[in-house]
Interface confidence: low
């Protein structure tokens, strides 16, 4: 649809409240260091301009693209050069290069202070004093720390955030009501951000085709009763939505996501029997619910896959006529029959099938050549199955914290050049796969575990891309999206690594560790563990376990001491000496 004024079109479609919220998110995701007040001022200016265009679409500048309007507005920020350095050079460019330039400067790990949660009474007072500013500040703080957060979904989080304060600030025990809700929102928000980051990485690094393949597989698992043409339509629309959001086109993205939810609900009879409850909800809840909806039951009478994709004499003819469509159909048919497989496994199978057809359809006897293609799938299926079985056994044996430690050691030995904070963050998240997925029955373990690991390993990839230090990480991250996890799994100890010089300061602890939460204390200990492995990559599990046990005892002892700081100073020296001796440093 051609509209005289794109900004007026989106303002009318989305309404003023959503328009303002989405523009704030967009600006905060681009200019991550700007103060809140500056962003609010910019958003208000854009909103006032949009209203003039709603009143008269022919008014001056109303015909400009959103990228032009928003880019021009961002480029008015006075401190752009001082705050952002070379990002200011983007403003010398014309659209569309300017927007591409802004996108390239999004920072996955911005140098921002950790968000500290104020006292409950302080938060409730702020909420009551100015609800609008309070909620805008939430959007701003999340968006600037997560520059690829899925904007329409962030509106859903903000709605829940508001509901939590509305309910709990009136409760008898405000803290007991509010804090668990805020913890849940924080954890869900981090997970949502990481999932969306993988979608954007898929699009940006591997192309639209890669994203569409992922979407075909996932939607076919979720909607196995839907016909291929229906799934294809949903995939095309979903790809457009995520392309827009990943590309900073948040107004278009939110608008198109609403249209997609509307379409799905209007056509749920031909899509899935599980959508009824979702479709009765208001828009933001509806879209979220559809995105998380459980897999529909598989049709009972699905024929064997082999008939169309191996036994048919028309395989090469069908493949040659429309390669992407034929491979898409293969992926659809395989995925709808296998909700027990991870999406990445399904994509590996499709890639193997494609490679086989490329080779065999040029052979003298194509059918003879590809007749056993399904046999090639067996080892691909067994590899993640075995890996998940082994790791779930280890998780059940060790519990989450010690399982994380085992992964910390494993990954530090594989890629010791990676920064310690990144190794700790990524290994802790990898370790959460145990409590997240190992509780599931066999049929749900692989999709849960391997697709979650894809999300976590993507965090490693995007953090490493900012400051590359390891060729092995670069190789696993860039060669194949679907083989990232097997690539990392296959890495052995890096024999080329020169151990880090020993620095006693790294292992010096103070009494402040005693007042930390259990999680923060774990992170301190896990940081020390990574540093130990970097000093002594050949240390055995037993040696590392002994040192970590001594370390835990040392912290416990000194936190109980009357003069904690003296205890940490004196006992700490002894611990460092003992650890050096135990590890032969």
């Amino acid at each position: 649809d051609a509209h005289k004024s794109e900004v007026a079109h989106r303002f009318k479609d989305l309404g003023e409240e959503n328009f303002k919220a989405l523009v704030l998110i967009a600006f905060a995701q681009y200019l991550q260091q700007c103060p809140f007040e500056d962003h609010v001022k910019l958003v208000n200016e854009v909103t006032e301009f949009a209203k003039t265009c709603v009143a008269d679409e022919s008014a001056e500048n109303c015909d400009k693209s959103l990228h032009t309007l928003f880019g021009d507005k961002l480029c008015t920020v006075a401190t752009l050069r001082e705050t952002y350095g070379e990002m200011a050079d983007c403003c010398a460019k014309q659209e569309p290069e300017r927007n591409e330039c802004f996108l390239q400067h999004k920072d996955d790990n911005p140098n921002l202070p950790r968000l500290v949660r104020p006292e409950v009474d302080v938060m409730c007072t702020a909420f009551h004093d100015n609800e609008e500013t309070f909620l805008k500040k939430y959007l701003y703080e999340i968006a600037r720390r997560h520059p690829y957060f899925y904007a329409p979904e962030l509106l859903f989080f903000a709605k829940r955030y508001k509901a939590a304060f509305t309910e709990c600030c009136q409760a008898a025990d405000k803290a007991a009501c509010l804090l668990p809700k805020l913890d849940e929102l924080r954890d869900e928000g981090k997970a949502s951000s990481a999932k969306q980051r993988l979608k954007c990485a898929s699009l940006q690094k591997f192309g639209e085709r890669a994203f569409k393949a992922w979407a075909v597989a996932r939607l076919s698992q979720r909607f196995p009763k839907a016909e291929f043409a229906e799934v294809s339509k949903l995939v095309t629309d979903l790809t457009k939505v995520h392309t827009e959001c990943c590309h900073g086109d948040l107004l278009e993205c939110a608008d198109d996501r609403a249209d997609l939810a509307k379409y799905i609900c209007e056509n749920q009879d031909s899509i899935s029997s599980k959508l009824k409850e979702c479709c009765e909800k208001p828009l933001l809840e509806k879209s979220h619910c559809i995105a998380e909806v459980e897999n529909d039951e598989m049709p009972a009478d699905l024929p064997s896959l082999a008939a169309d994709f191996v036994e048919s004499k028309d395989v090469c003819k069908n493949y040659a006529e429309a390669k992407d469509v034929f491979l898409g159909m293969f992926l659809y048919e395989y995925a709808r029959r296998h909700p027990d497989y991870s999406v990445v496994l399904l994509l590996r199978l499709a890639k193997t099938y494609e490679t086989t057809l490329e080779k065999c359809c040029a052979a003298a006897d194509p059918h003879e050549c590809y007749a056993k293609v399904f046999d090639e799938f067996k080892p691909l299926v067994e590899e993640p199955q075995n890996l998940i079985k082994q790791n779930c056994e280890l998780f059940e044996q060790l519990g989450e914290y010690k399982f994380q430690n085992a992964l910390l050691v494993r990954y530090t030995k594989k890629v010791p050049q990676v920064s310690t904070p990144t190794l700790v963050e990524v290994s802790r998240n990898l370790g959460k796969v145990g409590s997240k997925c190992c509780k599931h029955p066999e049929a749900k373990r692989m999709p849960c575990a391997e697709d979650y690991l894809s999300v976590v390993l993507n965090q490693l990839c995007v953090l490493h891309e900012k400051t590359p230090v390891s060729d092995r990480v670069t190789k696993c991250c860039t060669e194949s999206l679907v083989n990232r996890r097997p690539c990392f799994s296959a890495l052995e100890v890096d024999e080329t690594y020169v151990p880090k010089e020993f620095n006693a300061e790294t292992f010096t602890f103070h009494a402040d560790i005693c007042t930390l939460s259990e999680k923060e204390r774990q992170i301190k200990k896990q940081t020390a563990l990574v540093e130990l492995v970097k000093h002594k990559p050949k240390a055995t599990k037993e040696q590392l376990k002994a040192v970590m046990d001594d370390f835990a005892a040392f912290v416990e002892k000194c936190c109980k001491a009357d003069d904690k700081e003296t205890c940490f100073a004196e006992e700490g020296k002894k611990l460092v000496a003992a650890s050096q001796a135990a590890l032969g440093l």
Epitope: H67, P96, N99, L203, Q204, G207, H247, D249
Partner: nanobody
Amino acid sequence: QVQLVESGGGLVQAGGSLRLSCAASGRTLSSYDMGWFRKAPGKEREFVAAITRHDYNTYYRDSVKGRFTISRDNAKNTVYLQMNSLKSEDTAVYFCAARLDPIFASNSAYSNLYDYWGQGTQVTVSS
């Protein structure tokens, strides 16, 4: 491999029109996203227009919108750039480019994502 050959360039008065063609040999163009780029003396190569392979979506740089039109004829294995209301700042060597795997629609502006390039055709607009 795809070989791309541009034609249709030349000298034209400001306000005039030209139609550039890009003919492909070696493989069918229907598999590719196609783009036009240009390079003026002393300037970086810049995106002009693009057309996608699946849905024929078109994208233009702001300064040529409404004046230039990109189109494709898969049967003739050719992509066109119709340039009207030409201005002196449109003077440049125009390159045709093809790419196999689209990333973003608006990322069509990214020249490093294109796999194949033509040699270029000179367009000079005199005032």
